[in-house]
Every structure is written in structure tokens, then in C-alpha cells.
């Protein structure tokens, strides 16, 4: 698929890896919160 225009911004190039890591970390935290919530609901 075509790259979004923002990928042309130098910032995208310089921060791509850290932004991807930050997003992965955020998703992991979200998944952890969801698990905790399910545990509470399940009790």
C-alpha cells in the first residue's frame, strides 16, 4: 500500500523505530490492562 504523506517528513525517518516501539509498548500496556479487567470481571 502507498506510504502516507507524513512519511516524507524527515521526522518520520528519524523516529520511525522509536515510534513503533512506543506503539508496541502502548499496545502491551493496553493488553495488560484488559487482562486485569477480565480477571476482575471474571471473579
Amino acid at each position: 500500500s502507498e506510504e502516507p504523506p507524513i512519511s516524507l517528513d524527515l521526522t518520520f525517518h528519524l523516529l520511525r523505530e522509536v515510534l513503533e516501539m512506543a506503539r508496541a509498548e502502548q499496545l502491551a500496556q493496553q493488553a495488560h490492562s484488559n487482562r486485569k479487567l477480565m480477571e476482575i470481571i471474571g471473579k
Epitope: 524527515l10 528519524l14 515510534l19
Partner: antibody, heavy 118, light 112 residues
Framework: EVQLQQSGPELVKPGASVKMSCKAS????????MKWVKQSHGGSLEWIGV????????FYNQKFKGKATLTVDKSSSTAFMQLNSLTSEDSAVYSC???????????WGQGTLVTVSA | DVLMTQTPLSLPVSLGDQASISCRSS???????????LEWYLQRPGQSPKLLIY???NRFSGVPDRFSGSGSGTDFTLKISRVGAEDLGVYYC?????????FGGGTKLEVK
């Protein structure tokens, strides 16, 4: 013409928080990341963080994690920065800036002066 | 963090003279992609910073050719061949190769 118009000066009490804005015009807001910079009274410049107006992804200078929160409103092409638990150390001019495909800080807002005082 | 050290702190010049500002990084600022993301900015009194030079030696659009940037690795220089009144202000170097991105402390160009 690329323009970044920032909100006016703020006088706030220690411990309070402040939210400033940066309205972009003259280009497609979602095509470029927005950065924020702190300029202390002595003149030194510090990069605070960056936000993608596209999807709201943020990345912060470790020094400003927990101090600054960056958000955007795509409908009004406006970026925001909230600073919390303010102390006298946070008294400074805060600027938003946009890059290009070649440089990181090609266009700057005029800055918002924040004064923290009891 | 990469420390960017500028010298001199203050540079008194006569209009029409050449000025030279040095910027030294605490470690190499060659990015893993091979580029060196070293930029120069001028902040005139009461104004926001303006981009002059990007990637060490490239002038940004509208910047006069009397401004030139050079250097590599850890040592960089900004030269102004004929200083005009509009060139007075504080010059900052900046590196975007390593996170966190960092600015130099500034060099004030003023009339002698």
C-alpha cells in the same frame, strides 16, 4: 505560506497546569509532525517532544515525560501541549515547530510565554 | 545525551566582516543512515528561530549564499562571509542524529 499561530501568554500558580495551542495553516496539517521546544530565560533551547497529527502517536524527550502531554485536534488543525505540576523551572517560552523532508525545525510558531508565580 | 558546545559565546563583529562560529558535539553525530543531521538556526532579537542550514552544509530556501556550513563527525562551523545588520542575533547549532535531539547553547553575534 506555512503559519503556526500560538496562544497567548499564561500566568499560572505553582502546582497548577496549563494548556497552550498551536494552530497550523498554509499546509495539510496531517502531512507533518509537530514538535515542541522550550526556551528558558537564559536562551537555551530544549526539544520536548513530537506528535503525529495523523494518528496521535507521540514521542517525548525523557526529560519531559510526565511533565508535557501533546495532543492534536485534526478538525481545527491545532496542536496542544499541556504542562502539569508547574514549578518556577517551567517558566519559559514554549514554541511549536514543523519540519520538512530535509530539516526538523523549518517553521516555528511565535512562542507562548508561561510564567509560574505565586 | 549528545552535548553540543558552541564557541565563542559572544562574537563582536564589524558590519561587512566575516564571522565564524564553531559547534562541537560530545560524540559523532553521523546517523546510522550515513547522514549527519546538523542544523543551524538564527534567532533575531524578539523573534522565533529561523532555519539557515540543514545536514551540515545545505542552505534552506531563501537563505543568502553568504551563509555556509561545513564540518564532519564532531566538529562543525558556520561562516557568514559579509555580516549585515540583519544577521545579528543568537546562532544555535542542533543535532537530530541521536535521541534526544539537542541544541547548542548559542553564540551571540553583535556589533563591535
Amino acid at each position: 505560506e506555512v503559519q503556526l499561530q500560538q496562544s497567548g501568554p499564561e500566568l499560572v500558580k505553582p502546582g497548577a497546569s496549563v494548556k497552550m495551542s498551536c494552530k497550523a495553516s498554509g499546509y495539510t496539517f496531517t502531512d507533518y509532525f509537530m514538535k515542541w521546544v522550550k526556551q528558558s530565560h537564559g536562551g537555551s533551547l530544549e526539544w520536548i517532544g513530537v506528535i503525529s497529527p495523523n494518528n496521535g502517536d507521540t514521542f517525548y524527550n525523557q526529560k519531559f515525560k510526565g511533565k508535557a502531554t501533546l495532543t492534536v485536534d485534526k478538525s481545527s488543525s491545532t496542536a496542544f501541549m499541556q504542562l502539569n505540576s508547574l514549578t518556577s523551572e517551567d517558566s519559559a517560552v514554549y514554541s511549536c515547530a514543523r519540519g520538512t523532508d530535509r530539516a526538523l525545525f523549518a517553521y516555528w510558531g511565535q512562542g507562548t510565554l508561561v510564567t509560574v508565580s505565586a | 545525551d549528545v552535548l553540543m558546545t558552541q564557541t565563542p559565546l559572544s562574537l563582536p563583529v564589524s558590519l561587512g566582516d566575516q564571522a565564524s562560529i564553531s559547534c562541537r558535539s560530545s560524540q559523532s553525530i553521523v546517523h546510522s543512515d550515513g547522514n549527519t543531521y546538523l542544523e543551524w538556526y538564527l534567532q533575531r532579537p524578539g523573534q522565533s528561530p529561523k532555519l539557515l542550514i540543514y545536514k551540515v552544509s545545505n542552505r534552506f530556501s531563501g537563505v543568502p549564499d553568504r551563509f555556509s556550513g561545513s564540518g564532519s563527525g564532531t566538529d562543525f562551523t558556520l561562516k557568514i562571509s559579509r555580516v549585515g545588520a540583519e544577521d545579528l542575533g543568537v546562532y544555535y547549532c542542533f543535532q537530530g542524529s541521536h535521541i534526544p535531539w539537542t541544541f547548542g547553547g548559542g553564540t551571540k553575534l553583535e556589533v563591535k
